[in-house]
Interface confidence: low
């Protein structure tokens, strides 16, 4: 339904509070370096304009598109060229090219200072002094650091953030109440950001069809009692929501997400028996709850898949008549029967089925050709099962830190050209799969592990895309979305890599390491480990373990010494010499 004024339509649908919050998120995700005060000024100007349009939809400029209105507003920023360089050239373009240009300049790794958490009393005072500014600042700081964060979900995080301060700032022990809540929000926020980044990469790099296939598989696992037509409708609506959010259309995205939650709750009887609690919650909580809802029970009487997809004489006829619908039905039927498979595995099976039909439906005897197609699935299923089994055993044997180190070595040998900070960050996150998924029973391990690994490897892909240094990473990231993990798993040591020259400075440590937190100290040691492997890619596990054990002992010894700096200088030289000897550097 067409509206005379799009901005008035969204303002009325969302309400002033959500409108302002979403415009702030949108602006902060586009202009990530702009000061908070500048963004607030822009948002207030847009909001005042929107109110004039609500009062009179025929008023001047009210008929303009949101991209035009927002883009014009962003292009008024005086320091655009000084702060953003060539991004300023976007302002010379017309819509829709201007918005595409802004999107292309979003930075997944902006050069922003690490957020230091203020003291609890300081935060509570700031919260009480000006609650609105305090919460806006939270939205701004998260949005500029995570330019693809799912905007309606960020509103939900902000609501929880506000609730935490409201409760804890009047508690007897403010810190004991608040800090665990903030830690939880931080960790959940990072995970939410990474999951959404994969959705946007899927849409932007592999297209709508790839995203829809992912959504069919996931929703069919979650709602196995729903009819195919119902799942298809949900997939279409969900694709629209995420396309809008990934495209910077945050007002439309939030509005459509609310409509989708309303539809799901009105039709829960034909979707899932698990939605009742979610649907009793307020809007933001409801949408979040639906997105995280557990899988419904599988219908008891599901027939064998083979009848419709292998044994039927009409397989090629049905495929030829509507390829994507038939493949969608295959994916739906397979996924609803297999909550124990990862979504990416289900997509690999569907791709294998599609390739087989493409080949066989053109053969002399199609049925004979595709009769054994399900046999081709066996190795595809066993590969992630075996990999998860092996890695969970290794995790249980080593614990998280040493498991991360094993992955650091593995991935540095595979792609040594990648920057050390990226290798450390990605390998640490890959290593978290152990504590996240290995505790689950067999039936839940694969969907937990492989779909989580897809999210983490996407982080590697988007960071690498900014500064490409490895053809192997580019190849694994771009060839197939669903085969990224198997592609990285299959990489062996890069024999073409010329080892980094040894630089003693890289392995020179100072007494400041003693004042770091345990996590930061681990990162320092893991950084050194990556550098060691880059110097000596052929070093054995045993050699590296010996050097790392010596290193840990060296840090412990010098941190206990009276004259720490001297200890680090003198013992450090000995350690470097011993390491060079041990590794043959």
């Amino acid at each position: 339904d067409a509206h005379k004024s799009e901005v008035a339509h969204r303002f009325k649908d969302l309400g002033e509070e959500n409108f302002k919050a979403l415009v702030l998120i949108a602006f902060a995700q586009y202009l990530q370096q702009c000061p908070f005060e500048d963004h607030v000024k822009l948002v207030n100007e847009v909001t005042e304009f929107a109110k004039t349009c609500v009062a009179d939809e025929s008023a001047e400029n009210c008929d303009k598109s949101l991209h035009t209105l927002f883009g014009d507003k962003l292009c008024t920023v005086a320091t655009l060229r000084e702060t953003y360089g060539e991004m300023a050239d976007c302002c010379a373009k017309q819509e829709p090219e201007r918005n595409e240009c802004f999107l292309q300049h979003k930075d997944d790794n902006p050069n922003l200072p690490r957020l230091v958490r203020p003291e609890v009393d300081v935060m509570c005072t700031a919260f009480h002094d000006n609650e609105e500014t305090f919460l806006k600042k939270y939205l701004y700081e998260i949005a500029r650091r995570h330019p693809y964060f799912y905007a309606p979900e960020l509103l939900f995080f902000a609501k929880r953030y506000k609730a935490a301060f409201t409760e804890c700032c009047q508690a007897a022990d403010k810190a004991a109440c608040l800090l665990p809540k903030l830690d939880e929000l931080r960790d959940e926020g990072k995970a939410s950001s990474a999951k959404q980044r994969l959705k946007c990469a899927s849409l932007q790099k592999f297209g709508e069809r790839a995203f829809k296939a992912w959504a069919v598989a996931r929703l069919s696992q979650r709602f196995p009692k729903a009819e195919f037509a119902e799942v298809s409708k949900l997939v279409t609506d969900l694709t629209k929501v995420h396309t809008e959010c990934c495209h910077g259309d945050l007002l439309e995205c939030a509005d459509d997400r609310a409509d989708l939650a309303k539809y799901i709750c009105e039709n829960q009887d034909s979707i899932s028996s698990k939605l009742k609690e979610c649907c009793e919650k307020p809007l933001l909580e409801k949408s979040h709850c639906i997105a995280e809802v557990e899988n419904d029970e599988m219908p008891a009487d599901l027939p064998s898949l083979a009848a419709d997809f292998v044994e039927s004489k009409d397989v090629c006829k049905n495929y030829a008549e509507a390829k994507d619908v038939f493949l969608g039905m295959f994916l739906y039927e397979y996924a609803r029967r297999h909550p124990d498979y990862s979504v990416v595995l289900l997509l690999r099976l569907a791709k294998t089925y599609e390739t087989t039909l493409e080949k066989c439906c053109a053969a002399a005897d199609p049925h004979e050709c595709y009769a054994k197609v399900f046999d081709e699935f066996k190795p595809l299923v066993e590969e992630p099962q075996n990999l998860i089994k092996q890695n969970c055993e290794l995790f249980e044997q080593l614990g998280e830190y040493k498991f991360q180190n094993a992955l650091l070595v593995r991935y540095t040998k595979k792609v040594p050209q990648v920057s050390t900070p990226t290798l450390v960050e990605v390998s640490r996150n890959l290593g978290k799969v152990g504590s996240k998924c290995c505790k689950h029973p067999e039936a839940k391990r694969m969907p937990c592990a492989e779909d989580y690994l897809s999210v983490v490897l996407n982080q590697l892909c988007v960071l690498h895309e900014k500064t490409p240094v490895s053809d192997r990473v580019t190849k694994c990231c771009t060839e197939s979305l669903v085969n990224r993990r198997p592609c990285f798993s299959a990489l062996e040591v890069d024999e073409t890599y010329v080892p980094k020259e040894f630089n003693a400075e890289t392995f020179t440590f100072h007494a400041d390491i003693c004042t770091l937190s345990e996590k930061e100290r681990q990162i320092k040691k893991q950084t050194a480990l990556v550098e060691l492997v880059k110097h000596k890619p052929k070093a054995t596990k045993e050699q590296l373990k010996a050097v790392m054990d010596d290193f840990a002992a060296f840090v412990e010894k010098c941190c206990k010494a009276d004259d720490k700096e001297t200890c680090f200088a003198e013992e450090g030289k000995k350690l470097v010499a011993a390491s060079q000897a041990a590794l043959g550097l």
């Epitope: 203020p118 003291e119 100072h510 007494a511 003693c514 004042t515």
Partner: nanobody, 117 residues
């Protein structure tokens, strides 16, 4: 917002003493290691001393060892630097920083220490 306000500097004769203070706010002071850094005119910043979050670990540059003492009072969110046996070469702007950074962590201007007869 992080605030670090240094005080206690001034003009002192060689061999004299001064005690610098750094009042911290806007972050959980007790969870961070802290440093004193100085910058002499025309020179780069030099870390003078650092202290762990609980005060148990300390570090000193060779040039100040035995003369300067770093300490902290987490209940007051304050970092201290006791400077004895001052020398002309200790003349510099002194500022405190979070962690082991040698760049200012907050808007504080530092405090000027001048050692001259």
């Amino acid at each position: 917002e992080v605030q670090l306000l240094e005080s206690g500097g001034g003009l002192v004769q060689p061999g004299g003493s001064l005690r610098l203070s750094c009042a911290a706010s806007g972050f959980t002071f007790s969870q961070f290691g802290m440093s004193w850094v100085r910058q002499a005119p025309g020179k780069g910043p030099e870390r003078v001393s650092a202290i762990s979050s609980d005060g148990s670990g300390t570090i000193y540059a060779d040039s100040v060892k035995g003369r300067f003492t770093i300490s902290r009072d987490n209940s007051k969110n304050t970092l201290y630097l006791q400077m004895n046996s001052l020398r002309p070469e200790d003349t510099a702007v002194y500022y405190c920083t979070i962690g082991s950074s040698t760049t200012p962590s907050g808007p504080g201007q530092g405090t000027l220490v001048t050692v001259s007869s």
